[in-house]
Interface confidence: low
Amino acid sequence: EDLKKVFPPKVAVFEPSEAEISHTQKATLVCLATGFYPDHVELSWWVNGKEVHSGVSTDPQPLKEQPALEDSRYSLSSRLRVSATFWHNPRNHFRCQVQFYGLSEDDEWTEDRDKPITQKISAEAWGRADC
Amino acid sequence: PYIQNPDPAVYQLRGSKSNDTSVCLFTDFDSVMNVSQSKDSDVHITDKTVLDMRSMDFKSNGAVAWSNKSDFACTSAFKDSVIPADTFFPSPESSC
C-alpha cells in the first residue's frame, strides 16, 4: 500500500426524517463516512456514551466512490433506528464514531511510523424536542 | 429474513447546513426487492442491509443513496430499482 496516499474519512450524521417519524413512529439516523483511503475503517454507534448494537445496520464493506478507478476512495454508511419517543427526548445523545487506520506523511497524529495509528473521527446528534 | 409488515418508503434526511450532501433512505421494503446501483457515478447507493430493533422485535430492510449534486432528489435516487410511486415522502420544510 502507498503509505503516502492516505485520506481520513469525513463523518456526518443525518437526522431522521419527520415524515418517517410520523409515518412509522420510528426514527432512523444515517451516518456517512466518505472519502477515505485505504478501506480500513470500523464504524460504531454510541448512545449516551455507550456503544449500541441493537437497531444498527452497517454496510458489510465500504463502497468504492469511483468504481472505475483502481485506487478510488471509499465510503461507508450505517443506520441507527430508534423509537420516535427516544429520538425526541432531548437528553439522548447519538454519536457515530469511525476509526480509521493508516499512516500518512503529513498527519500530526502519526508519531510512530512503524505501527498503524488509529484516528477516531465522529459526528454527533442530540435528540430533538424542538429546533 | 422475513419482514412481517413491509411498508416501503423513501425519506429524505437532513444534515447540517454546512453539509452539501443529500441523503435518501429507502426502508421497510420486502426482502424480495432488490436495490440497483446507480448508473450516475455521482450518486452512491448502498446494497440493502437488514436492521434488527431487538427491543421491539422488529426487523427492516434498508438502503441509502447520497450525492453532492445540487439537483439530486430522492424521487430519482432509486430510479433504477422498482419502487411504487406512493413510496416517496417529501421532506417538510424546516420551521427552525
Epitope: A12, V13, A123, E124, A125, W126, C131 | -
Partner: nanobody
C-alpha cells in the same frame, strides 16, 4: 456562533486542587452539551468529563473520584473542580460545547494546568 473562554489554570503541587471555568457566549441557548478535554505534550487530546442537558455527567476513568464537572446556567459557565492532582494531569485543558444539531462543535483556546513539586 458560540465563543468559549477557559480560565483557572496554573501551577499546583501534587495533591493540590484547581477549579477551571469555561464561560460561553453567543448562541448559548442552543448548547446542551459541555465537555472538558485535555491534551498533554506529545499525546492525543482526551476526554476528561462531560455534562449534558439535565446535568447528566460522564467522566473518564482517570478523572473519576477526583474531578467534578458542574455548570451554572445563569452564568453560562461550566466548571471543572480538580482535586488530588497528579503530575500526569499536567496538560492543556480545553472546554467544548455542542449545540442542539451536530456538527456545531465549539472549542475554547485552552488553559494550562501544570502539576509539579
Amino acid at each position: 456562533e458560540v465563543q468559549l473562554v477557559e480560565s483557572g489554570g496554573g501551577v499546583v503541587q501534587p495533591g493540590g486542587s484547581l477549579r477551571l471555568s469555561c464561560v460561553a457566549s453567543g448562541y448559548v441557548h442552543k448548547i446542551n452539551f459541555y465537555g472538558w478535554y485535555r491534551q498533554a505534550p506529545g499525546k492525543e487530546r482526551e476526554k476528561v468529563a462531560h455534562i449534558s442537558i439535565g446535568d447528566q455527567t460522564d467522566y473518564a476513568d482517570s478523572a473519576k473520584g477526583r474531578f467534578t464537572i458542574s455548570r451554572d446556567e445563569s452564568k453560562n459557565t461550566v466548571y471543572l473542580q480538580m482535586n488530588s492532582l497528579r503530575p500526569e494531569d499536567t496538560a492543556l485543558y480545553y472546554c467544548r460545547a455542542l449545540s442542539r444539531i451536530w456538527p456545531y462543535d465549539y472549542w475554547g483556546q485552552g488553559t494550562l494546568v501544570t502539576v509539579s513539586s
